[in-house]
């Protein structure tokens, strides 16, 4: 007789990351009897929703339901039907929606309301849609990577389960770059966190953590580009903007109305004698870097030390995982290797930005031109942000690990968010049973 497989005693969870440029749905899975163990939850699916971020639906909220359909249907397929009703669904919106809410609380609320109504139509256990704070985004990203790296496990292991593991219990810092904001989160070394807004206290698995975090709204890669363009067009003599952050030969027409369609460019707003201007790329890394640095106000600091714009930043400590757009951009540029020094990265960026646009288009024929055209800016921005913004040095650069996935799960805030909301990270260390760490064997 054939052996009948025992039903898997597993649980599932769904988190939608409603970012500024797009929405992604993540499905997580874990053994039901090991909920409180560290490192047992893993990602089984990522579905990228086709279209822009949800904040772009403010004038067409009735289209949100259709927008979410494909990925929600995918979730219906991946998760066994018997599990649907007990699978929690969470949607967290980040900086794109924070910016919309700055403009109007009602507009942001209307978008979320339609999102909630759409997600409630599925057979899952919908738990709500909300705009998470920048502090939460930083904190959950930090929890995610340290959970996946096994940093919360009290058992020291004689072998490494992930490439970045240094086999000690020192946590990794988290560097997250989105389209509209960027987060820096880490445990400083015996340093008082001078600004209460940037201090978090956690007790996880029986250990206390004093964590520094800050989210820089408007300093995600897309909003930083809008800021830079708004700043530079102020001093342009006509409707041509010769831009060092785009490849030589690149041309693009920008509507002034689009430039000022974000709260992030308000400080640079002025009446221009034209409705449109043309970006003409000149591809010069050094000039691009200089232009980007003008977005960081480093002249004012009310603390012992700051990142930029008067925001407290303690001395950097330990290793850092840099994920989301930090990883995607550096991966495209082939600069994620641990062996590549900061000087080498800068050298490669100089060469890349100087390459003619026609040559770039030929070399990367499969990449959408909109994205392809912005890698010079994005790469330069990442270097500027890490070096001048966060004060990494050529020496400390080797402590930055560009991470896409850890153990098959995407690095990002969504896993930490779900772990928290499902109470899967206990404050105290669970009583160990002989099988509690069998997953490592």
């Amino acid at each position: 007789t054939q052996n009948k497989a025992l039903p898997e005693n597993v649980k599932y969870g769904i988190v939608l990351d409603a970012g500024s440029s797009h929405t992604s749905l993540y499905i997580y899975k874990w053994p039901a009897e090991k909920e409180n163990d560290t490192g047992v939850v893993h990602q089984v699916e990522e579905c990228r929703v086709k279209g822009p971020g949800i904040s772009k639906f403010v004038q067409k909220v009735n289209e949100i339901g259709i927008y979410l359909t494909d990925c929600m249907e995918r979730a219906r397929e991946v998760i066994p039907r018997s599990q649907h009703q007990e699978t929690p669904v969470y949607l967290g919106a980040t900086a794109g929606m924070r910016l919309l809410r700055m403009e109007s609380e009602e507009l942001a609320d209307r978008v979320l309301d339609v999102v909630e109504r759409s997600l409630s139509n599925y057979p899952f256990d919908f738990q709500g849609a909300r705009i998470i704070t920048g502090q939460e985004e930083g904190a959950y990203g930090w929890i995610t990577i340290n959970y996946l790296l096994g940093k919360f496990s009290q058992k020291t292991r004689w072998f490494s389960i992930v490439p970045y593991e240094t086999n000690n219990q020192e946590t990794f810092g988290a560097l997250d770059l989105g389209g509209a904001s960027t987060q820096v989160t880490f445990v400083p070394q015996n340093q008082t966190i001078e600004s209460p807004d940037n201090a978090l206290q956690f007790r996880l698995y029986g250990k206390d953590y004093n964590v520094y975090t800050h989210s820089f709204l408007c300093y995600g890669k897309d909003q930083a580009l809008w800021q830079k363009l708004a700043k530079d067009i102020q001093v342009a003599s006509n409707e041509i903007l010769r831009d060092p952050c785009f490849h030589p030969g690149y041309k693009k027409v920008v509507n002034v109305s689009d430039l000022y369609k974000t709260p992030c460019t308000k400080r640079f707003e002025m009446t221009l004698p034209f409705q449109q201007f043309e970006i003409q790329g000149i591809g010069n890394y050094q000039q691009c870097h200089q232009s980007i640095l003008e977005l960081f106000n480093t002249s004012y600091c009310p603390y012992s030390q700051c990142a930029f714009n008067g925001i407290f930043l303690p001395p950097l400590q330990g290793d850092f995982g840099a994920f989301s757009a930090f990883y995607f951009v550096m991966k495209f540029l082939n600069l994620t290797s641990e062996k590549v020094s900061q000087e080498k990265v800068t050298e490669m960026m100089k060469k890349f930005c100087a390459q003619p646009w026609e040559e770039i288009k030929t070399s990367y024929a499969g990449v959408k031109e909109k994205y392809l055209s912005e890698y010079c800016f994005s790469g330069t921005y990442i270097l500027s942000l890490l070096l001048q913004g966060y004060h990494f040095t050529a020496d400390s650069w080797e402590h930055i690990h560009f991470i896409g996935k850890i153990q098959g799960s995407d690095a990002g805030w969504t896993l930490g968010y779900m772990l928290n909301l499902t109470n899967m990270i206990p404050a105290e260390q669970p009583l160990s049973t002989p099988l509690s760490h069998s997953t490592y064997v």
Partner: antibody, heavy 123, light 106 residues
């Protein structure tokens, strides 16, 4: 002190056009959404159009959609209402009004109003 | 459109007494309801925003309550200077106003 001063009203024949202006002062204009609200003689208030602070959201009442166009010039601290194909029922006192704020977030209520400019549509 | 119905259409209250005006929305508007006072020949003046928050410079005699579809503006105690038209306005959907309530002081 916040001030909103409307101008451009007057007597106009049905089918013709008129452009209203609102000059704002006493606050950072580009941080606030702006609106037009009207009041027919002896009647209640009727919202006409909104223009959010970063132009993410521009909206019109059904009664004026396709005929009226709201715009703003942040550098001139000015709000405008271009009114085309005017009808007798557009006769009203037109107020310029500023969006309020809920702490750090914008709100679609009206915390400051101008004195209004009268538009009379009659042959 | 979200229709707002104010009641009563008019009321007369003696000084020192309480005046209560209600506003009912044709659909839920969360807490996005606001109240204005308009005196003859003047533009409207904001009294209450987001159902219960007192606008700057408005006396504490004015208060607002409610959420969803039913909202109330209360003036307690009423003073002679409160003679005016009072309007509710919702902002959950594109803005709409109630038809107004005329308050007279006896």
């Amino acid at each position: 002190e916040v001030q909103l001063v409307e101008s451009g009203g007057g007597l106009v024949q049905p089918g013709r056009s008129l452009r209203l202006s609102c000059a704002a002062s006493g606050f950072t204009f580009n941080n606030y959404g702006m609106n037009w609200v009207r009041q027919a003689p002896g009647k209640g208030l009727e919202w006409v159009s909104s223009f959010s602070s970063s132009s993410t959201y521009i909206s019109y009442a059904d009664t004026v959609k396709g005929r009226f166009t709201i715009s703003r010039d942040n550098a001139k601290n000015s709000l405008y209402l271009q009114m085309n194909s005017l009808r007798a029922e557009d006769t009203a006192l037109y107020y310029c009004a500023r969006h309020g704020r809920y702490g750090g977030y914008g709100g679609f209520y009206f915390d400051y109003w101008g004195q209004g400019t009268m538009v009379t549509v009659s042959s | 459109d979200t229709v707002l119905t104010q009641s009563p259409a008019s009321l007369a209250v003696s000084p020192g007494q309480r005046a209560t005006i209600t506003c009912r929305a044709s659909e839920g508007v969360k807490s996005y309801m606001h109240w204005y006072q308009q005196k003859p020949g003047q533009p409207p003046k904001l009294l209450i925003y987001k159902a219960s928050n007192l606008a700057s410079g408005v006396p504490a005699r004015f208060s607002g309550s409610g959420s969803g579809t039913d909202f109330t503006l209360t003036i307690n105690p009423v003073e002679a200077d409160d003679t005016a038209n009072y309007y509710c306005q919702q902002s959950w959907n594109d803005p709409t106003f109630g038809q107004g309530t005329k308050l007279e002081i006896k």
